[in-house]
C-alpha cells in the first residue's frame, strides 16, 4: 500500500524522517521538534521525550485524532492503515498467551482496546505513520525537482 512500506507496528520506525518544504525536519505536531528528529535513520537517534505542557499536548492529540480520521478518509490504503494501527495497539501478538484466543486486530475492531494506553499507542503509531508519509512525499518532490533541473 502507498507509503506503508518500511513501517512496522508497534514501535513504528519510519525508514525516512519527515521533512518540510524547506528541507528542514518537520516540527512536532504542536510546533516543538523532537530532538534528533532531523538525523538520518542510519544515525543513532537521540530522540528525547517529547514532553510538553498539558494544554499543548492535548491540542496535539486532538490534531492527531483529526489527522487519523483524514488519513483513513483520504488514503486508498485506509483499510490497511486501520489494520496496521490495530496491530500497533495490540502489541503485534498474533493471539498472545493465556486467554488471548482471538486475533488482536479483531478485538480492536470490536472496541475492546478502549484503555488509555491503547489509545496512546494508536496516537503514537499514527504520528509516526504520518511523519513517514510526509517524509516520503517530500523526498519524492525533491527527486522530481532534481530531475527537472538536470533536464534543463
Amino acid at each position: 500500500s502507498p507509503a506503508a512500506a518500511g513501517l512496522r507496528f508497534p514501535g513504528i520506525r519510519p525508514e525516512e524522517e519527515a521533512y518540510g518544504e524547506d528541507g528542514n525536519p518537520l516540527p512536532d505536531f504542536d510546533g516543538s521538534e523532537p530532538p534528533g528528529a532531523g538525523s538520518p535513520a542510519s544515525a543513532p537517534r537521540a530522540a528525547a521525550a517529547w514532553y510538553r505542557p498539558a494544554g499543548r499536548r492535548d491540542v496535539a492529540h486532538g490534531i492527531l485524532n483529526e489527522a487519523y480520521r483524514k488519513v483513513l478518509d483520504q488514503l486508498s490504503a485506509g483499510k490497511h492503515l486501520q489494520s496496521l494501527v490495530a496491530r500497533g495497539v495490540g502489541g503485534s501478538l498474533g493471539g498472545g498467551a493465556g486467554d488471548d484466543a482471538e486475533p488482536l486486530s479483531k478485538r480492536h475492531s470490536d472496541g475492546i482496546f478502549t484503555d488509555s494506553y491503547s489509545r496512546y499507542r494508536k496516537q503514537m503509531a499514527v504520528k509516526k505513520y504520518l511523519a513517514a508519509v510526509l517524509g516520503k512525499r517530500y523526498k519524492q518532490r525533491v527527486k522530481n525537482k532534481g530531475r527537472r533541473i538536470a533536464y534543463l
Epitope: R8, F9, P10, G11, I12, R13, P34, R45, A47, A48, A49, W50, Y51, R52, P53, A54, R57, D58, H61, G88, G90, G91, S92, L93, G94, G96, A97, G98, D99, D100, L104, D115, S116, Y117, S118, Y120, R121, Q123, M124, A125, K128
Partner: antibody
C-alpha cells in the same frame, strides 16, 4: 528540573500495610503521563509493579502478582501513591517511582526517583 | 506472561572493546523493548527505547537492535564508566497491558 521523590518507606510488620507516595517536582501530570512503580529486592533485579495514567483517565495496569494486593492512585496533579497490603518478607525491597517516556510506543521509564526502602520484618 | 531472558552474565570487556548483551522474549513483542543501565545505589537509567531509539543524552556508543523475540544491546568502544548492570524491559499484551524486566546482565570492565 524535573524530579520524582518517593517517601513513606520504612519497617513494617508481616501482614501489615503501607502507603508509599511519589511526588513530582518541576512538572505536574499531563495527558499521557503514565506514572509507574518498580521494586528491587536487595541484590536482585528490577520488578514491575504497575502504572497509572496520571494525566487523564486514571486507568491502571498491574503485574499479575500485584493485582488485588497493590493499589496505585493519583492523589493530586503532582502525587501518586502505592498502597500495599498483606506484606511479607518477600516484599522487602527498594520501591522506585518512574515516569513513562512520552513519545515511546512501549512502556519505557525515562525519569526515576531515588527509591524508598521498605523492610518487612517482625 | 512474557518472560525476558538475558544472556550472558556476567560479561567481561576490555576498555575500547565491544560488548553484546542479548535479551530473548518468550513471545513476540514487536519492537516493544527498552534497555536500562543501573549502577549500585542508583536508580536505573534509560538507554534505548522502542528497541533501537537512543534516549536523550545517551552516548552513541550504545545501540539497540532486534524485534519480535530477539533483541541486542551493543556497547562499542567500552569505557570504564560502562561498568554496571544492564536490564531489558519488554511490553506486551495478554488480556491487558503488561511490562516485565529481564534478570539483568552485569558488565565488568577490565
Amino acid at each position: 528540573q524535573e524530579q520524582l521523590v518517593e517517601s513513606g518507606g520504612g519497617l513494617v510488620q508481616p501482614e501489615g500495610s503501607l502507603t508509599l507516595t511519589c511526588t513530582a517536582s518541576g512538572f505536574s501530570f499531563s495527558s499521557s503521563d503514565y506514572m509507574c512503580w518498580v521494586r528491587q529486592a536487595p541484590g536482585k533485579g528490577l520488578e514491575w509493579i504497575g502504572c497509572i495514567d496520571a494525566g487523564s483517565s486514571g486507568d491502571t495496569y498491574f503485574a499479575s502478582w500485584a493485582k488485588g494486593r497493590f493499589t496505585i492512585s493519583k492523589t493530586s496533579s503532582t502525587t501518586v501513591t502505592l498502597q500495599m497490603t498483606s506484606l511479607t518478607a518477600a516484599d522487602t525491597a527498594t520501591y522506585f517511582c518512574a515516569r513513562h517516556l512520552y513519545g515511546s510506543i512501549t512502556f519505557a521509564f525515562g525519569l526515576w526517583g531515588q527509591g524508598t526502602l521498605v523492610t518487612v520484618s517482625s | 506472561a512474557a518472560v525476558l531472558t538475558q544472556t550472558p552474565s556476567p560479561v567481561s570487556a576490555a576498555v575500547g572493546g565491544t560488548v553484546t548483551i542479548n535479551c530473548q522474549a518468550s513471545q513476540s513483542i514487536g519492537s516493544d523493548l527498552a534497555w536500562y543501565q543501573q549502577k549500585p545505589g542508583q536508580p536505573p537509567k534509560l538507554l534505548i527505547y522502542d528497541a533501537s531509539t537512543l534516549a536523550s543524552g545517551v552516548p552513541s556508543r550504545f545501540s539497540g537492535s532486534g524485534s519480535g523475540t530477539q533483541f541486542t544491546l551493543t556497547i562499542s568502544g567500552v569505557q570504564c564508566d560502562d561498568a554496571a548492570t544492564y536490564y531489558c524491559q519488554g511490553t506486551y499484551y495478554s488480556s491487558g497491558w503488561y511490562t516485565a524486566f529481564g534478570g539483568g546482565t552485569e558488565v565488568v570492565v577490565k
